[in-house]
Interface confidence: low
């Protein structure tokens, strides 16, 4: 039987009355062409909604916008457009919301063509009040908050100036000209690239990378011949042009650019690219594009220094620079990532890793599904997940995969079951164990969201017709109940719930259309009365993550430790609550060779866990640059996988080789380094 139609499905009693009492409609007194919504702070209940309307005229764009504010999670909204003097707000800059619970908001206004600079509206009290500030420049980008201090803002101007404010946008100072890209680092450090001659485009590959640690009082050039740079975890990456040709290589620094090492990754040519897929303080996933217009490349995973890389996955789908990749971090279970590969026959297949890129496999076929037309063998096939690439190809996929750190083990995604991704209409699948096993959850495409840390899943059918029904499940998608939230169907445009999946409120956005009027409307449904009581100890059960063989003493060991979680029982209908903290009990595992990666100059032969010396490097000086100096590299061929916590067990000690190497990179040779003061 289809999910939700089992006789065993535990129904929530009287849910219609309970939800009806907690359904709040808000009709917006306008229909501007677009609506954008932002949550201000965490657990504050404050939402800002900006509606905008563009009228392109021959000489200029005339626009109108309205600003609304809710402080009860979207149940009621107040028009606060007068707080911003009825000014037109530029949607391309969005609403710049400050980090954490700073309560800060910056709105960038549209100004007339002849003005000296732009205009912003600033709030530091969760949008209760706004201050208008005229800027001495026209912003090119949204204001960027320092992650450490929300009073510090930076912005690029249309003239390529780098502007900084130390008092939350009240006063601005241009700290550098000819800037291409700027980013906040840690400790209020700013990294930026500059051009010397023509422009950012003309100087690509000849840019300089600069750093200021004191908001523009003094500067240090930390890189030359730069093509681009990026930050990930504790790593600073720069792609640097080679001396001899038009290729470039990745260099990495873990000390904010004071010292650099050449990453042991292939160099790339003009038409290729590097991309940091994911990074944390332990390691980085790096995609290196293949030569030619292939649409794929190779994923490499780094060691703890960001220097030595292991090949993780071949033929990784990534269309073009800044293009589409399906690479997804499954945040509900440690070590799990999902992505797509382009197979030899040009079909697209989904792969999953449970050990941070160590091994990749196909997704197990859901037990309640049959293989589709893409499958050669009707009994053997896999689940393939639709993500960014499918969405970009305009397949009938309304949402990317969803997982939340506090909804342990839950992954929801559109997919198809066969030998490859199908262009047919997808269904929605759910995993409750971080991607090891899957079940069909809903027929056809849906919008979905997780509430109350997984206690409730809400879904709305993706349809071109007006809708008035929402589906919800209190047992991780096994059984579904439907609730008609309005008599008059609406054209649905989106589901909105507070980021973090702790809320019990969901807002359904859409518009009504009749012969005379059309209006934006939102329905906010509070599920608090569905989950009547707070969860107690008896509502939780112990679950061992990554468990595949309970008989095995090392069952559940991933990256050197296993974790037992307290998980809400599917049969329990209760509130985890806003204060819910994931309870987990880690235990350390014994080391095996799987807990080590092969150090530079070593590799693992197929189906062997030992690291052996690379034949082509035997007796060679290694082209390996560490901190820009020639030095000896001592290694026993193994290096602990970043983040691996194993102890005891196998200790792969062998004769320590002294690998002499020369440093061929003159990147940032000492004479190129200079310090300047403003």
């Amino acid at each position: 039987s289809a999910p939700g139609e089992d006789e065993e499905c535990g129904r929530v009693r009287d849910f219609v009355a309970k939800l009806a009492n907690n359904t709040h409609q808000h009709v917006f007194d306008d229909l501007r062409a677009s609506v954008s919504l932002s949550w201000v702070g965490d657990s504050t209940g404050v939402i800002l909604v900006l509606t905008t309307f563009h009228v392109p005229l021959v000489i200029m764009t005339f626009g109108q916008s309205k600003l609304y504010r809710s402080e009860d999670y979207g149940k009621n909204f107040k028009d606060i457009t007068d707080l911003i003097n009825n000014t037109f707000i530029r949607t391309e800059f969005g609403m710049a919301i400050g980090p954490e619970n700073s309560g800060k908001v910056v709105l960038t206004a549209e100004v007339s063509g002849g003005s000296r600079g732009g205009r912003i509206f600033r709030s530091s009290d969760f949008a209760k009040n706004f201050v208008q500030t005229d800027l001495p420049f026209h912003p090119l980008t949204q204001m960027m908050y320092s992650p450490q201090n929300s009073d510090y803002l930076l912005a690029l101007s249309t003239e390529n100036g780098l502007w900084v404010s130390k008092n939350f946008g009240g006063k601005w100072e241009e700290i550098h000209k000819a800037v291409c890209l700027a980013k906040w680092g840690s400790d209020n450090t700013i990294f930026f690239t500059t051009y010397a001659n023509g422009s950012c485009k003309a100087d690509l590959g000849a840019l300089e990378l600069w750093r200021t640690s004191d908001l523009g009082k003094s500067f240090k050039t930390i890189g030359v011949k730069i093509y681009s740079f990026g930050l990930g975890g504790r790593f600073l990456f720069a792609s640097v042009m080679a001396d001899k040709d038009t290729t470039r290589r990745i260099h990495v620094s873990t000390d904010q650019g004071d010292t650099w090492s050449m990453a042991q990754l292939p160099s790339v040519g003009q038409e290729q690219f590097y991309s940091i897929l994911a990074a944390n303080d332990d390691m980085v996933f790096m995609h290196v594009d293949e030569p030619g217009d292939t649409g794929f490349g190779t994923i490499f995973t780094s060691d703890d220094r960001g220097i030595v890389y292991s090949k993780s996955l071949d033929r990784h789908l990534y269309t073009t620079t800044g293009g589409e990749t399906d690479f997804t971090n499954v945040t509900s279970l440690r070590g799990v990532y999902i992505t797509s590969v382009l197979s030899e026959d040009n079909s697209i297949q989904t792969m999953i890793t449970f050990d941070q890129g160590g091994r990749w496999t196909h997704l197990r076929k859901p037990e309640n599904s049959e293989c589709d037309a893409t499958a050669k063998n009707k009994n053997e096939c896999s689940l393939h997940i639709h993500a960014s690439y499918s969405i970009s190809q305009k397949l009938n996929v309304p949402m990317a995969p969803l997982s939340e750190p506090n909804a342990v083990g839950i992954v929801i995604a559109h997919g198809s079951v066969g030998d490859a991704i199908s262009v047919m209409v997808p269904d929605v699948y759910i995993s409750d164990d971080g991607g090891y096993s899957w079940t069909k959850m809903l027929e056809g495409p849906h919008y979905y969201t997780i509430l109350d840390s997984g206690g409730i899943i809400v879904a709305i059918e993706h349809s071109s017709r007006p809708i008035n029904v929402i589906k919800f499940s209190t047992d991780e998608g096994q059984c579904w109940q439907t609730y008609t939230f309005t008599r008059d169907p609406i054209y649905f445009t989106g589901l909105a719930s507070e980021p973090g999946a702790r809320s019990m409120n969901i807002s359904i956005w859409g518009f009504t259309e009749s012969f005379l009027t059309s209006q934006w409307v939102s329905y906010t449904i509070d599920f608090k009365d569905i989950l009547e009581r707070n969860c107690e100890e008896k509502d939780y059960t112990i679950w061992l993550a990554h468990s595949t063989d309970p008989e095995d003493y090392e069952d559940g060991c991933i990256l050197g430790y296993k974790e037992q979680f307290l998980r809400l029982r599917k049969s329990s209908v209760c509130q985890n609550g806003r204060d819910y903290v994931v309870t987990k009990q880690p235990s350390i595992c014994l080391c095996s060779l799987e807990d080590f990666l092969c150090d530079f100059g070593y590799y693992r032969p197929e189906n062997d866990s030992k690291c052996v010396e690379q034949p082509e490097l035997k007796g060679h000086d290694l082209e390996f640059c560490l901190y820009g100096r020639e030095e000896h590299l001592t290694t026993n061929g193994y290096r602990k996988i970043p983040g691996d916590k194993c102890q005891g067990g196998v200790n792969p000690v062998r004769e320590v080789k002294d690998l002499k190497k020369k440093c061929t990179s003159n990147f940032l040779s000492p004479e190129k380094q200079n310090s300047k003061s403003n």
Partner: antibody
């Protein structure tokens, strides 16, 4: 090591104001909130309020609202607590305490409380005519 | 505001014995509760946070339990240095509030 060093003892007349400082060292100043707690002679602990060194947002106990002002100077990693319109019952030892979670000015606390893990040595304020 | 009530006000215990201190909240504070120890002339010292987690450097004889409105601090075998005043403090909703304290004295 992590330390909070407070300013010295003060003797004030009723109606006056007092400003106590608390200098933090050994950790990133902006990474933790700071609470102020006082203790009258022979009495228990009383929480006065909290300041977020990032941005300077504050939340005060209702009892002190309008009389207390908490500020910070990130350049010197120092927080200040000023209490005005002093009365004899304000005679107490005033402590600053590092508060790893803290509340935003907007309301409810964070989801997991780590406790005030580092305390200053205390500043004795005596209010007497 | 949430009112924290500690009992007993004074507890007389012999060295080596077990001491059990109670703290009750006027409404649920989940596990957002801390325990502190204060000796005469000294600043308070954090013992327990999150209702049951020992702070760094606190001996294993100190343990905390409870959730919601009822909390307990247990000192399994009192040492001479443990005679002091103990306070509980909630951080579920502002303003933070302390209990009135329990004085543990030598019997």
């Amino acid at each position: 090591q992590v330390q909070l060093v407070q300013s010295g003892a003060e003797v004030k007349k009723p109606g006056a104001s007092v400003k106590v400082s608390c200098k933090a060292s050994g950790y990133t100043f902006t990474s933790r909130y700071m609470s102020w707690v006082r203790q009258a002679p022979g009495q228990g602990l009383e929480w006065m309020g909290i300041i977020n060194p990032v941005g300077g947002s504050t939340s005060y106990a209702q009892k002190f609202q309008g009389r207390v002002t908490m500020t910070r100077d990130t350049s010197t990693s120092t927080v200040y607590m000023e209490l005005s319109s002093l009365r004899s019952e304000d005679t107490a030892v005033y402590y600053c305490a590092r508060d790893p979670s803290g509340i935003a000015a907007a309301g409810p606390a964070s989801r997991y409380y780590y406790g005030m893990d580092v305390w200053g040595q205390g500043t004795t304020v005596t209010v007497s005519s | 505001e949430i009112v924290m009530t500690q009992s007993p006000a004074t507890l007389s215990v012999s060295p080596g014995e077990r001491a059990t201190l109670s703290c009750r909240a006027s409404q649920s504070v989940s596990s957002n509760l801390a325990w502190y120890q204060q000796k005469p002339g000294q600043a308070p010292r954090l013992l327990i946070y999150g209702a049951s987690t020992r702070a760094t450097g606190i001996p294993a004889r100190f343990s905390g339990s409870g959730s919601g409105t009822e909390f307990t601090l247990t000192i399994s075998s009192l040492q001479s240095e443990d005679f002091a005043v103990y306070y509980c403090q909630q951080a579920r909703l502002g303003p933070w509030t302390f209990g009135g304290g329990t004085k543990v004295e030598i019997k």
